[in-house]
Amino acid sequence: QLPPGKPEIFKCRSPNKETFTCWWRPGTDGGLPTNYSLTYHREGETLMHECPDYITGGPNSCHFGKQYTSMWRTYVMMVNATNQMGSSFSDELYVDVTYIVQPDPPLELTVEVKQPEDRKPYLWMKWSPPTLIDLKTGWFTLLYEIRLKPEKAAEWETHFAGQQTEFKILSLHPGQKYLVQVRCKPDHGYWSAWSPATFIQIPSDFIMNDHHHHHH
């Protein structure tokens, strides 16, 4: 029987900069029941606080609700593992909420086949940013990525759309039914999950274009 091994806080995420959750990995348990506590202070403070909510994020997590979350202050946190034989501490972790945002997927993905008379046909898609993300403040830049594939295909084709919320794709297989999805990430955050798939039937008379795709 031994003291617990060193835990590691390995992940912190915020859906919208207003709340966030951090997760830790326990070290070895030393063969004894082990208690974990997360303590933190914010930059400019010396007073240590204990995690306000060990429940919401699931096992080995600490959730910071709205009243505990500040975008303006860096959080300095540490996990303590204790059993009957002793204690061990994780390394200190520094968290700036700006850099841990993982948004919800984009919304309202619509996909249409456009067949202008004077030009080659193309697939046109548009979407909206997730509702929880406030883009009006200016500091939040969302980047988007699209993926699509014929229904029966194994491989996805991905396209980076930058900050645009619409996109054209010119090269598709006529007569195929395609699945299309979009996801987003802040410049220094994390990719959202993919949006639910939207299906689009490409007409049999769709003319393949030499140019693969272009941004709108």
């Epitope: 992940k11 975008m71 303006w72 390394d91 850099y99």
Partner: antibody
Framework: EVQLVQSGAEVKKPGSSVKVSCKAS????????IHWVRQAPGQGLEWIGE????????NYNQKFKGRATLTVDKSSSTAYMELSSLRSEDTAVYYC???????????WGQGTLVTVSS | DVVMTQTPLSLSVTPGQPASISCRSS???????????LHWYLQKPGQSPQLLIY???NRFSGVPDRFSGSGSGTDFTLKISRVEAEDVGVYYC?????????FGGGTKVEIK
């Protein structure tokens, strides 16, 4: 203990490429961005770019875009910086550095001297 | 790119005496999220840089309290209240508000 261990010194000819490695240990490699910074002899520090090892997303200093390529190998917890079309002005010590969930550099590698000479 | 200008270029200090380094940026370092990402690093002779101060005034873990940072907007200062022999090296200010991140030219601190 967090460690960033870089590959050894390199001597390269002008016009060639160099690939510097940075092996991370003591933490979950995919959790934090890796940055690359260089320092020419007797000079200050210059930021080359950054990579998120979780998805290989990169941001580059425009000065190096097209010449520097940042990559990672998650299986070996190693980050790489490749610089092509080398010229004598690229002679420098190249550092990898790691952030937390922040945008400043908490841990640094020991540096790799790259000498470009004909 | 944001230009970071440090003064003085070098500083010779008697042990136990204070030292002050100034850093000025060519544009405001206040991020649109309200934070100011101005940091100070020390590069001791023959070593890699090490973080001293993050976000203007916050000492990094293990940094002695004789180091302090202050300033706002475009003007920032690093102060050492009582210089010790182990403080010799080159001090760099750095901003990470704007991409590309940039560094000052450095201030060399030596002991008299």
């Amino acid at each position: 203990e967090v460690q960033l261990v870089q590959s050894g010194a390199e001597v390269k000819k002008p016009g060639s490429s160099v690939k510097v490695s940075c092996k991370a240990s003591g933490y979950t490699f995919t959790s934090y961005w890796i940055h690359w910074v260089r320092q020419a002899p007797g000079q200050g520090l210059e930021w080359i770019g950054e990579i998120d090892p979780s998805d290989s997303y990169t941001n580059y200093n425009q000065k190096f875009k097209g010449r520097a390529t940042l990559t990672v190998d998650k299986s070996s917890s190693t980050a790489y910086m490749e610089l092509s079309s080398l010229r004598s002005e690229d002679t420098a010590v190249y550092y990898c550095a790691r952030s937390f969930f922040t945008n400043w550099f908490a841990y640094w590698g020991q540096g790799t001297l790259v000498t470009v000479s004909s | 790119d944001v230009v970071m200008t440090q003064t003085p270029l070098s500083l010779s200090v008697t042990p136990g005496q204070p030292a002050s380094i100034s850093c000025r940026s060519s544009q405001s370092l206040v991020h649109s999220n309200g934070n100011t990402y101005l940091h100070w690093y020390l590069q001791k002779p023959g070593q890699s840089p090490q973080l001293l101060i993050y976000k203007v005034s916050n000492r990094f873990s293990g940094v002695p309290d004789r180091f302090s940072g202050s300033g706002s907007g475009t003007d920032f200062t690093l102060k050492i209240s009582r210089v010790e022999a182990e403080d010799v090296g080159v001090y760099y200010c750095s901003q990470s508000t704007h991409v590309p991140f940039t560094f000052g030219g450095g201030t060399k601190v030596e002991i008299k």
